[in-house]
């Protein structure tokens, strides 16, 4: 293993756990993750007497590095005293030392949040002659804090008298400003605001961002929607370029494929935004099979004012697959809105996150503008989920009280779709709703023709049905009653239900 310097941590008790009459108290210092041995731990106890004991080093199993603890026991007037633990590791370098200064015990406190903000560029997108960094130390329990600025890890000589502290309620905030020359800022150094508080160190770092992309201009490349890919079978991908400054030069968007094969003809659209910037989109039709087989597509953006081309690429998502579960619900009637009702659809536990959601009524797909669907969110362990919301009118549910929420997803089988039906008034057609649970799966058939699963209207028979004690020719579970719908002029539909 290569030489590794230790990380040093103070070990203290909670103040509330130390008896007020305690005549001596022990604190410690942990040096961990170093290699090779040894480390030297010494203590500065000020004017107090103390006895120290350094435990033998132990080996950390995974890394093979070492850890050791040094303990200091002090007696007398230790309550307000600060102690310094000094750890030296000569194998790292002859002068490698880490000092930790802390008190005997730690009070319950809220630690600070440390955040560095930087001044803006000028109107033309250029750095001004000086750059200001502002270190915000916020939300901590009032107490002494020390702020240090580091440049590439080295302490800077900064006038900290300008640091100001304010208190809001029970928490305090402090800010410190660092002014840098443009030359220093552009030199690619890292600047760190380091805060010491209650024996702990908190920090945030910043540096000039790498010019991987020209300032201000962003490009995004979308994957085809599952609906376009699996249902319409005409997938497209879109390259979107935003925040372009309108100018005489032309923005060029060029498409290519990683395989080197030719691309289809793309369509292009330019839009001037309210803030004066230009948005350019280019949409490329892709082959369904090419996409499913993992072809990578690239969009290259060039413009005379861009210092370099922007490149974006997209391909089918890798990783495991899981089909969505779909649950549809109707909200109860709300006072004052008897003629409107909200339907909700929870689609969950699918992977990857690409999904299309549709609502259907009367076997017709409703326009996307009718419903609102969230972006996929992680469930932390079992896939992604979305919610979709549809508002329906009385006229619609009186015409036909069945709405379908359909999810299109690559892992859904057999046809990449999963759907659930929902009614605004489930089961009210045949009288009062009963409390038994409707069967999980309700099958219907006409004559010998097996039909699709059909909702049994909750647990209540259709008004044109009569219930009997099961029929010998019905292939379903014997424990369920059978209901025969006596539809005029048609072969009777037979379905199981709880009558």
């Amino acid at each position: 293993a290569s030489t590794q310097s230790p990380s040093v941590f103070p070990l203290t008790r909670c103040c509330k756990n130390i008896p007020s009459n305690a005549t001596s108290v022990t604190l410690g210092c942990l040096a961990t993750g170093y290699f090779p041995e040894p480390v030297m731990v010494t203590w500065d106890t000020g004017s107090l007497n103390g006895t120290t004991m350094t435990l033998p080093a132990t080996t950390l199993t995974l890394s093979g590095h070492y850890a050791t603890i040094s303990l200091l026991t002090v007696s007398g007037a230790w309550a307000k005293q600060m102690f310094t633990c000094r750890v030296a590791h000569t194998p790292s370098s002859t002068d490698w030392v880490d000092n930790k200064t802390f008190s005997v015990c730690s009070r319950d406190f809220t630690p600070p949040t440390v955040k560095i903000l930087q001044s803006s560029c000028d109107g033309g997108g250029h750095f001004p002659p000086t750059i200001q960094l502002l270190c915000l130390v916020s939300g901590y329990t009032p107490g002494t804090i020390n702020i240090t600025w580091l440049e590439d890890g080295q302490v800077m000589d900064v006038d900290l008298s300008t640091a100001s502290t304010t208190q809001e309620g029970e928490l305090a905030s402090t800010q410190s400003e660092l002014t840098l020359s443009q030359k220093h800022w552009l030199s690619d150094r890292t600047y760190t605001c380091q805060v010491t508080y209650q024996g702990h160190t908190f920090e945030d770092s910043t540096k000039k961002c790498a010019d991987s992309n020209p300032r201000g201009v962003s490009a995004y490349l979308s994957r085809p929607s599952p609906f376009d890919l699996f249902i319409r079978k005409s997938p497209t991908i879109t390259c979107l370029v935003v925040d372009l400054a309108p100018s005489k030069g032309t923005v060029n968007l060029t498409w290519s494929r990683a395989s080197g094969k030719p691309v289809n003809h793309s369509t292009r659209k330019e839009e001037k935004q309210r803030n004066g910037t230009l948005t350019v989109t280019s949409t490329l039709p892709v082959g369904t099979r090419d996409w499913i087989e993992g072809e990578t597509y690239q969009c290259r953006v060039t413009h005379p004012h861009l210092p370099r081309a922007l490149m974006r690429s997209t391909t089918k998502t890798s990783g495991p697959r899981a089909a969505p579960e779909v649950y549809a619900f109707a909200t109860p009637e709300w006072p004052g809105s008897r003629d409107k009702r909200t339907l909700a659809c929870l689609i969950q536990n699918f992977m990857p996150e690409d999904i299309s959601v549709q609502w259907l009524h009367n076997e017709v797909q409703l326009p996307d503008a009718r419903h609102s669907t969230t972006q996929p969110r992680k469930t932390k362990g079992s896939g992604f989920f979305v919610f979709s919301r549809l508002e329906v009118t009385r006229a619609e549910w009186e015409q036909k009280d069945e709405f379908i929420c359909r999810a299109v997803h690559e892992a859904a089988s057999p046809s990449q779709t999963v759907q659930r039906a929902v009614s605004v008034n489930p089961g009210l057609a045949g009288g009062s709703a009963q409390s038994q649970r409707a069967p999980d799966r309700v099958l219907c058939h006409s004559g010998q023709q097996q039909g699709l699963p059909r909702a049994a209207g909750g647990s209540v028979p259709h008004p044109r049905c009569h219930c009997g004690a099961g029929r010998a020719d019905w292939p379903g579970p014997p424990e369920l009653d059978v209901c025969v719908e006596e539809a005029e002029g048609e072969a009777p539909w037979t379905w199981t239900g709880l009558c």
Epitope: L60, L62, S63, M351, E353, K378, T379, K380, G381, G383
Partner: nanobody, 122 residues
Framework: EVQLLESGGGLVQPGGSLRLSCAAS????????MAWVRQAPGKRPEWVSS????????HYADSVKGRFTISRDNAKNTLYLQMNSLRPEDTAVYWC???????????????YGQGTLVTVSS
């Protein structure tokens, strides 16, 4: 651009061992927690194991505890999964994965490799 490439899969007899590797590129490997995920044929995906940036903290699914060991070599930008005492139920595609936010336990990860097939059969 984050790229992960698994290798080391193959056919092995029950009780045997395999070592999977995952070569990472396009990001600062040492700054990211890493994980292994698997999916058996016809089953839902299953998180297998995770390791923190420094390699000191590791977590395992109950089904592999004591048999699988996750490790990493930040100098080589490589993640490993040592699989011992393999069982037929370990047959699956194995992916190495990472995430911008959280990779120290079950998750839907932001980035996956292409996967490597492990078949445990006599």
């Amino acid at each position: 651009e984050v790229q992960l490439l698994e290798s080391g899969g193959g056919l092995v007899q029950p009780g045997g061992s395999l070592r999977l590797s995952c070569a990472a590129s396009g990001f600062t490997f040492g700054n990211y927690d890493m994980a292994w995920v698997r999916q058996a044929p016809g089953k839902r995906p299953e998180w297998v194991s995770s390791i923190d940036t420094g390699g000191d903290i590791t977590h395992y699914a109950d089904s592999v505890k004591g048999r699988f060991t996750i490790s990493r070599d930040n100098a080589k930008n490589t993640l490993y999964l040592q699989m011992n005492s393999l069982r037929p139920e370990d047959t699956a595609v194995y992916w190495c994965a990472t995430d911008e936010e959280y990779a120290l336990g079950p998750n839907e990860f932001d980035y996956y490799g292409q996967g490597t097939l492990v078949t445990v059969s006599s």
